[in-house]
Each structure stands twice: as structure tokens, then as C-alpha cells.
């Protein structure tokens, strides 16, 4: 799996999970989240050569097409596969609210 | 929806469905498929600016991050959303076989 256990160790040029810490205030301009101040969002990036973690038959076809027609810009892309939620604390007036934001943390990647 | 009805009419710079005809023999080196000789595979391509057909909360966060930090290359990517199968005819010896290859045709796209 193209997850932290593999990708953070191997720093692949191909599609892999990349660490990314996001500071809510500095990086997103969000002042409404009280805790946490930021989180390890991670993201997916890297090349998608033929058969590198292809998600579908179409992405396999596309990467093979791209191998044979390298001048074409039709190639698969490295995107998130498994995502996890993030629990946040914010306030409405003086009332604290705890909420789980779904699909905030990328855990693994794929070529799609 | 970022499908043919919208994308083929509007020729968007942003993430959209793009037409792509694939000739099995010429483009993939596949000689085993007897019919069809090729098919409209299509593919997804284009920019993923903030809120342009974002797939998940993470892709929305990432596109906002990329807006505020444009020098970073951590941005969502335009990939297939809905896919359809393709029915093919091939031969094993002299015996014709009809098979449905799943996820061969892209019908719509998303930023993920």
C-alpha cells in the first residue's frame, strides 16, 4: 500500500503519500477552529508509470497509452485512496462544540 | 457534472472530461482484441482551483492551501469519477469469446 509506512521510508519519485502539516490559521486562513491549531493532512503526489498502483482498468490503459504515446498529456494521476476524519473543537459564542470533519487526513494513495 | 454534456461543449481549462479515442493495436500494442478496433476511452485533465468539483473535504482543504501557498505543488488532481464497461470480442484459438471489461470508459471527472 502507498501509505506512510512505505512512502515516508522510501521517498519514492512515483505516486506516494507525502507528509503535509497544515496550520489552520496560516495555511488556510481559518480562525474558527480552536483546537487543534493544525494537523497532519498529508497528500498524494508523484508519477504514475504503467502498473504503478493502478486503481482501475482505465488507469492501466491510460498509463500504457502514455508509455507508447509519451507526448500525450493523457496520463493517470496520483490521488488519495483511504482518508480519515479529524476531530476539532470550535466555539459558537461561548459554547464549545466538538465535531468530526470527515475525509480530512489522507492515509494512502493510488493512481487513478 | 463534469461529463461529456458539459465538458465537450464548454472546453474548460479546469478539470473536465476530455475526448480520447484509443486504437487497441496502435496505441496499446494489443492485438488480441478482435472487435472493436478501438473505443472512446476519454480521460480527465485540467486545473483544480478552490471549490471546483472537489471530491472530499481534504481536496477542498488542499485546493485552498494551494491558493494561499501557490509555490507549493500540493494540489488536488483531476481524475475519473464515473466509469463504464466495454464489451469486446476476442478469440481463444478459433473460439469467439465475448467479455465485458469493467471500468474502461470515463464518463465524468472530479478533483480529488
Amino acid at each position: 500500500a502507498l501509505d506512510a509506512a512505505y512512502c515516508f521510508r522510501n521517498v519514492q519519485d512515483n505516486c506516494c503519500l507525502r507528509p503535509l502539516y497544515i496550520d489552520f490559521k496560516r495555511d488556510l486562513g481559518w480562525k474558527w477552529i480552536h483546537e487543534p491549531k493544525g494537523y497532519n493532512a498529508n497528500f498524494c503526489a508523484g508519477a504514475c508509470p504503467y502498473l504503478w498502483s493502478s486503481d482501475t482498468q482505465h488507469s492501466r490503459v491510460l498509463s500504457l497509452y502514455n508509455t507508447i504515446n509519451p507526448e500525450a498529456s493523457a496520463s493517470p494521476c496520483c490521488v488519495s485512496q483511504d482518508l480519515e476524519p479529524l476531530t476539532i473543537l470550535y466555539y459558537i459564542g461561548k459554547t464549545p462544540k466538538i465535531e468530526q470533519l470527515s475525509n480530512m487526513i489522507v492515509k494512502s494513495c493510488k493512481c487513478s | 457534472a463534469l461529463d461529456a454534456a458539459y465538458c465537450f461543449r464548454n472546453v474548460q481549462d479546469n478539470c473536465c472530461l476530455r475526448p480520447l479515442y484509443i486504437d487497441f493495436k496502435r496505441d496499446l500494442g494489443w492485438k488480441w482484441i478482435h472487435e472493436p478496433k478501438g473505443y472512446n476511452a476519454n480521460f480527465c485533465a485540467g486545473a483544480c482551483p478552490y471549490l471546483w468539483s472537489s471530491d472530499t473535504q481534504h481536496s477542498r482543504v488542499l485546493s485552498l492551501y494551494n491558493t494561499i501557498n501557490p509555490e507549493a505543488s500540493a494540489s488536488p488532481c483531476c481524475v475519473s469519477q464515473d466509469l463504464e464497461p466495454l464489451t469486446i470480442l476476442y478469440y481463444i484459438g478459433k473460439t469467439p469469446k465475448i467479455e465485458q471489461l469493467s471500468n474502461m470508459i470515463v464518463k465524468s471527472c472530479k478533483c480529488s
Epitope: 521510508r9 | 509555490e71 500540493a74
Partner: nanobody, 119 residues
Framework: QLQLVESGGGLVQPGGSLTLSCAAS????????MSWVRQAPGKGLEWVSV????????HYSDSVKGRFAISRDNAKNTLYLQMNSLKPEDTAVYYC????????????RGQGTQVTVSS
């Protein structure tokens, strides 16, 4: 709070050597790849090197390949950059960064350490 403190810079003659260090705190250092980036006077940030979390995989920019060596000591939460055969064009402020700076550019946390190569 994630903190990175670079040290080891200085003035060195062309052909000389230096070893930069980066002390990391506030996160689980051993789980993350780490990078070195640099900023020459009047220029943007340039990626120099990246090392995998266990130190096994290393990549270098073409401009430093064969001259610089990245390493890490996970027990000490420290990243290193051994710089040999230094050239005047290596003059820059050097920063360490968490993650793979080939993909997330323009982000530095520490104050950096100045390296000047001049005769």
C-alpha cells in the same frame, strides 16, 4: 510545536567542506522524511536533498549530486548535510524541512544557517 534549528554554517574556501546539522523537536522525527533546501541571495528556495524516515533512501538535486551527503540520527532527532567540494554557487542560507521538499516548496520553519563559499 514543531521546531527545527539549523547550525554549522560559516565561511569556507572553494573546495572546502562543512557539515550542517538540524535539531528537530515537537514531532515524531523518526516517522518522517526530511529535506534540505537553500536560498541563494536574491533567488527562490531550491530543493537540495531528501532522506527517507529510516535513512535508507536518499535523493539529491543535480547541482549537488556526488558532493553532498544527507544523513540522519533518529535517536538524536537530528538531520545532517555533509557538504564537500564546495563551490561559490553553493553560497546560500540552508534550511531543513520536514517532509519531501520536492513536493512542498516554499516552506521553512527554522532560521536557517548561512553558508558562504569565497576565497
Amino acid at each position: 510545536q514543531l521546531q527545527l534549528v539549523e547550525s554549522g554554517g560559516g565561511l569556507v574556501q572553494p573546495g572546502g567542506s562543512l557539515t550542517l546539522s538540524c535539531a528537530a523537536s515537537g514531532f515524531t522525527f523518526s516517522l518522517y522524511p526530511m529535506s534540505w533546501v537553500r536560498q541563494a541571495p536574491g533567488k527562490g528556495l531550491e530543493w537540495v536533498s531528501v532522506i527517507g524516515s529510516d535513512g535508507g533512501t536518499k535523493h539529491y538535486s543535480d547541482s549537488v549530486k556526488g558532493r553532498f551527503a544527507i544523513s540522519r540520527d533518529n535517536a538524536k532527532n537530528t538531520l545532517y548535510l555533509q557538504m564537500n567540494s564546495l563551490k561559490p554557487e553553493d553560497t546560500a542560507v540552508y534550511y531543513c524541512a520536514e517532509g519531501d521538499s520536492r513536493y512542498v516548496r516554499g516552506r521553512t520553519r527554522g532560521q536557517g544557517t548561512q553558508v558562504t563559499v569565497s576565497s
